[in-house]
């Protein structure tokens, strides 16, 4: 058993039928010694008396808010949550496996630049009685500070018969060094509580591996005289790290016909312009990627040919 | 060329070669994310590689003030990785394919380090750890780890030379 926060405790249980469970001793936070009784949740049934209460915690029915009273007055509370360990593996019932980039991916994170700011998100089908708390650090043995905000519900989607809820959080490394080569990964820890179930999820990554630039901005076409060719130009996204002579991007320019089946023409360039042939009803798209490290491509920025 | 005395390197040549190094490092190990190397054991094997750290002067301001600290750090790293790529880890079983980019990568690391330090000048180099994994699968894992680490190192080096070529070239 360990303390999650004040008066909230997590009991770790090997989870299988007939498991012996864990013996837990609760102590009433009071100088009183006599006349103390204990109850669980809203029930008025007295579970025991005395300054301490010993319970065998086996199932969710044994978890909940234990309260000690004296003469009708509440003295203190202890909320017991359960953390299930099935077959040696901590349960992951609350969050959905996003399966990208690999199985058992519950948290996904992205950064728009090297400033040390990043966003993580996760999915669940649970709509109520759900709380999240997020902590992060650079490295784990001698952790350096990363500050995370509160997790918020960022999207709701309907998936078949189910509703899916997306939560996200923004974090910022306290003393980021954008130009350095990371040697210690960022660790992100999410505590999830649904009713009386506790779970924790972790992700470990280098900022360089989660970089996804915003799409290029100010995408423009300039027709070239007496030619079917156009000059496409664009700019670095505002959110990208500066100076651009140091934090350089590379670009992919694509000409795509109206039909998805039509052949796509692609050009790769380090410049912020390119000359392409603009077909009727086609569109021109440009996306960006770090020039020197193959992290994710940005989403496409597009303009129609006409 | 960068000499210990402090004259400027051939920024544009270094830029071209370091960008080629980035391409080669990624073609040698393109499987990003397919193997989470941090989940595997053997942490000590790649902990000793030289990293370009915050105080090494490789940021734009540091380069403007005095690029020598940064160039020395990059040189150290290049020599370190060049030795690793020439070691038993890469030459032993399982053999690399004949068209593997590792050979080119090895040669380019040497080429860039020589651009930074002509013969007769010596910056101190870091001792390479004695890594001789016994099992072929351990060697394979170590190759992946070294290449992932090299990708991060050469990315920073390439940024340094690109910025130098754009802003510090005579």
């Amino acid at each position: 058993i360990w303390e999650l926060k004040k008066d909230v405790y997590v009991v770790e249980l090997d989870w299988y039928p007939d498991a012996p469970g864990e013996m837990v001793v609760l102590t009433c936070d009071t100088p009183e010694e006599d006349g103390i009784t204990w109850t669980l949740d809203q029930s008025s049934e007295v579970l025991g008396s005395g300054k301490t209460l010993t319970i065998q915690v086996k199932e969710f029915g044994d978890a909940g808010q234990y309260t000690c009273h004296k003469g009708g007055e509440v003295l203190s509370h202890s909320l017991l949550l359960l953390h299930k360990k099935e077959d040696g593996i901590w349960s992951t019932d609350i969050l959905k496996d996003q399966k990208e980039p690999k199985n058992k991916t519950f948290l996904r994170c992205e950064a728009k630049n090297y400033s040390g700011r990043f966003t993580c998100w996760w999915l669940t089908t649970i709509s109520t009685d759900l709380t999240f708390s997020v902590k992060s650090s650079r490295g784990s043995s001698d952790p350096q500070g990363v500050t995370c905000g509160a997790a918020t519900l960022s999207a709701e989607r309907v998936r078949g018969d189910n509703k899916e809820y997306e939560y996200s959080v923004e974090c910022q490394e306290d003393s980021a060094c954008p130009a350095a080569e990371e040697s210690l990964p960022i660790e992100v820890m999410v505590d999830a509580v649904h009713k009386l179930k506790y779970e924790n999820y972790t992700s470990s990554f280098f900022i360089r591996d989660i970089i996804k630039p915003d799409p290029p901005k100010n995408l423009q076409l300039k027709p070239l005289k007496n030619s079917r060719q156009v000059e496409v130009s664009w700019e670095y996204p505002d959110t990208w790290s500066t100076p651009h002579s140091y934090f350089s991007l590379t670009f992919c320019v694509q000409v795509q016909g109206k039909s998805k089946r039509e052949k796509k023409d692609r050009v790769f360039t380090d410049k912020t312009s390119a000359t392409v042939i603009c077909r009727k009803n086609a569109s021109i798209s440009v996306r960006a990627q770090d020039r020197y490290y193959s992290s994710s491509w940005s989403e496409w920025a597009s303009v129609p040919c006409s | 060329r960068a000499v210990p005395g402090g004259s400027s390197p051939a920024w544009t040549q270094c830029q071209q070669l370091s960008q080629k190094l980035c391409t080669l490092a990624w073609s040698a190990h393109p499987l990003v994310g397919h193997m989470d190397l941090r989940e595997e054991g053997d942490e000590e094997t790649t902990n000793d590689v030289p990293h370009i750290q915050c105080g090494d002067g490789c940021d734009p301001q540091g380069l403007r003030d005095n690029s020598q600290f940064c160039l020395q750090r990059i040189h150290q790293g290049l020599i370190f990785y060049e030795k690793l790529l020439g070691s038993d880890i890469f030459t032993g079983e399982p053999s690399l394919l004949p068209d593997s980019p590792v050979g080119q990568l090895h040669a380019s690391l040497l080429g860039l380090s020589q651009l930074l330090q002509p013969e007769g000048h010596h910056w101190e180099t870091q001792q390479i750890p004695s890594l001789s994994p016994s099992q072929p699968w351990q060697r394979l894992l170590l190759r992946f780890k070294i290449l992932r680490s090299l990708q991060a190192f050469v990315a920073v080096a390439a940024r340094v030379f690109a910025h130098g070529a754009a802003t510090l070239s005579p």
Epitope: W15, Y16, P17, D18, E59, F60, E86, D87, G88, I89, D93, D97, T125 | E40, W137
Partner: antibody, heavy 116, light 106 residues
Framework: EVQLLESGGGLVQPGGSLRLSCAAS????????MSWVRQAPGKGLEWVSS????????DYADSVKGRFTISRDNSKNTLYLQMNSLRAEDTAVYYC?????????WGQGTLVTVSS | DIQMTQSPSTLSASVGDRVTITCRAS??????VVWYQQRPGKAPSLLIY???TLESGVPSRFSGSGSGTEFTLTISSLQPDDFATYYC????????FGQGTKVEIK
């Protein structure tokens, strides 16, 4: 005492369907993950499928993926295995067991024979 | 898929013998290994999980060891009840069993 009792086995033709049931008692069924494991006559054990306590997450062996469906009815304390497009190689004793990976409690098994 | 190769496939022994069964995984699987015993005509029963943890109620003559790719089940002094088939199983990724080792009377 934990008890698991399989039923629904029998003889079926190739291409046919069968639904196995496993009635659980002696524990809070809705709290625990469950699995099906099979054993061909005279052969070794093969994991078939698992389902989490809520029924929200399921896993299948490649050999049955797309043909078998695991489900549960927590109100009836029952685990199911719907088997479609049955093949001769699906002939086996099918056991239901507690757990997703470590099978602590097993039923006595039900024999499924696929033959024309 | 991860393959689990058990050896030997049959083992002849006498009461009181020390018996060792080996299981080799096709890749590093840490300690995510389980051992089961199956008597003829019966369902399997759990002996050991996480490579070396003895299930409650299982006699202490059974022990498990190993990590990575090599695992062993040892019966320190074979009893009449122990003549059965033993299976290892990995649960590092998905679930696969070894082909079984039959321990028979010499």
């Amino acid at each position: 005492e934990v008890q698991l009792l399989e039923s629904g086995g029998g003889l079926v033709q190739p291409g046919g369907s069968l639904r196995l049931s496993c009635a659980a008692s002696g524990f809070t069924f809705s709290n625990y993950s469950m699995s099906w494991v099979r054993q061909a006559p005279g052969k070794g054990l093969e994991w078939v499928s698992s389902i989490r306590s809520s029924g929200g997450r399921t896993d299948y062996a490649d050999s049955v993926k797309g043909r078998f469906t695991i489900s549960r009815d927590n109100s009836k304390n029952t685990l199911y295995l719907q088997m479609n497009s049955l093949r001769a190689e699906d002939t086996a004793v099918y056991y239901c067991a507690t757990g997703i990976a470590v099978a602590r409690y097993w039923g006595q098994g039900t024999l499924v024979t696929v033959s024309s | 898929d991860i393959q689990m190769t058990q050896s030997p496939s049959t083992l002849s022994a006498s009461v009181g013998d020390r018996v060792t069964i080996t299981c080799r995984a096709s890749q590093n699987i840490g300690t995510w290994v389980v051992w089961y015993q199956q008597r003829p005509g019966k369902a399997p029963s759990l002996l050991i999980y996480k490579a070396s943890t003895l299930e409650s109620g299982v006699p202490s003559r059974f022990s498990g060891s190993g990590s990575g790719t090599e695992f062993t089940l040892t019966i320190s002094s074979l009893q009449p009840d122990d003549f059965a088939t033993y299976y290892c199983q990995q649960f590092y990724t998905s679930k696969t069993f070894g082909q079984g080792t039959k321990v028979e009377i010499k």
